[in-house]
């Protein structure tokens, strides 16, 4: 018979002849010949591999370093890597969470809703009407404009979101 | 060169006080966010308080919360962490941070033991 050109899928091609892929979880020990099955092995303890494949070598687990406030969220298996977050105030740098920071900050005219955990961001909301915040922060929430009138005086100028009103002494009427 | 020196740490029994402060030096102390952060023998990193620039908002984890007290005084460029009510679990190296502080700038920390 001719020779397959294609195989099924989770199958591979090799030697003019097609063998099954290794399911997740185990690694290529050698292929099918005429008359064997492709040999497989499960991976090791901290090992994984999460599809059907032909590989020789698991992929070693992502470890979540302490040292860069990386905590395990979700062990690995045989057939999925580990999954790393950040210590409770820190927030992944990117997807895959190699690495934290501190609470990511407000922008000046925003203020923080929500501060950061180890699985969610800042949140941050726009300082409405009457309120500000000057500063980019983790920290800071919006703030009432200061009352002018409490203190007997008049505003000189009004706020904005990002900057608070200034105050000035009342026009005194001449006599 | 940005500097952070934490001191005011010690030996103290459970139930006890202490004051920590971190002095900041090399960059604008009053427009950052600051942070303390603990690290336990053998454990990982833990954020415990932090500050907004001008102070008025602070944050705290909640295994420290309505026992820690975090402050700032601009003037000085010095940050403080009042620490009331020790318990044995907050033993620990405590760290200042700056702002989002990508581990990069940190101190040696001071060491704050709590035993009987």
């Known amino acids: 018979p001719e020779p397959p050109t294609a195989c099924r899928e989770k199958q591979y091609l090799i030697n003019s002849q097609c063998c099954s892929l290794c399911q997740p979880g185990q690694k290529l020990v050698s292929d099918c010949t005429e008359f064997t099955e492709t040999e497989c092995l499960p991976c090791g303890e901290s090992e994984f591999l999460d599809t059907w494949n032909r590989e020789t070598h698991c992929h070693q687990h992502k470890y979540c370093d302490p040292n860069l406030g990386l905590r395990v969220q979700q062990k690995g298996t045989s057939e999925t890597d580990t999954i790393c977050t950040c210590e409770e105030g820190w927030h992944c740098t990117s997807e895959a969470c190699e690495s934290c920071v501190l609470h990511r900050s407000c922008s000046p005219g925003f203020g923080v809703k929500q501060i950061a955990t180890g699985v969610s961001d800042t949140i941050c909301e726009p300082c409405p009407v009457g309120f500000f915040s000057n500063v980019s922060s983790a920290f800071e929430k919006c703030h009432p404009w200061t009352s002018c009138e409490t203190k007997d005086l008049v505003v000189q100028q009004a706020g904005t979101n990002k900057t608070d009103v200034v105050c000035g002494p009342q026009d005194r009427l001449r006599a | 060169e940005v500097q952070l020196l934490e001191s005011g740490g010690g030996l103290v029994q459970p139930g006890g006080s202490l004051r920590l402060s971190c002095a900041a030096s090399g960059f604008t102390f009053e427009s950052q966010d600051m942070s303390w952060v603990r690290q336990a023998p053998g454990k990982g990193l833990e954020w415990v308080s932090g500050i907004s620039p001008n102070g008025w908002d602070t944050y705290y984890a909640d295994s420290v919360k309505g026992r820690f007290t975090i402050s700032r005084d601009n003037s000085k460029n010095t940050l403080y962490l009042q620490m009331n009510s020790l318990r044995a679990e907050d033993t620990a190296v405590y760290y200042c941070?700056?702002?989002?502080?990508?581990?990069?700038?940190w101190g040696q920390g001071t060491l704050v033991t709590v035993s009987s």
């Open positions: 941070a700056k702002d989002r502080s990508d581990f990069d700038y």
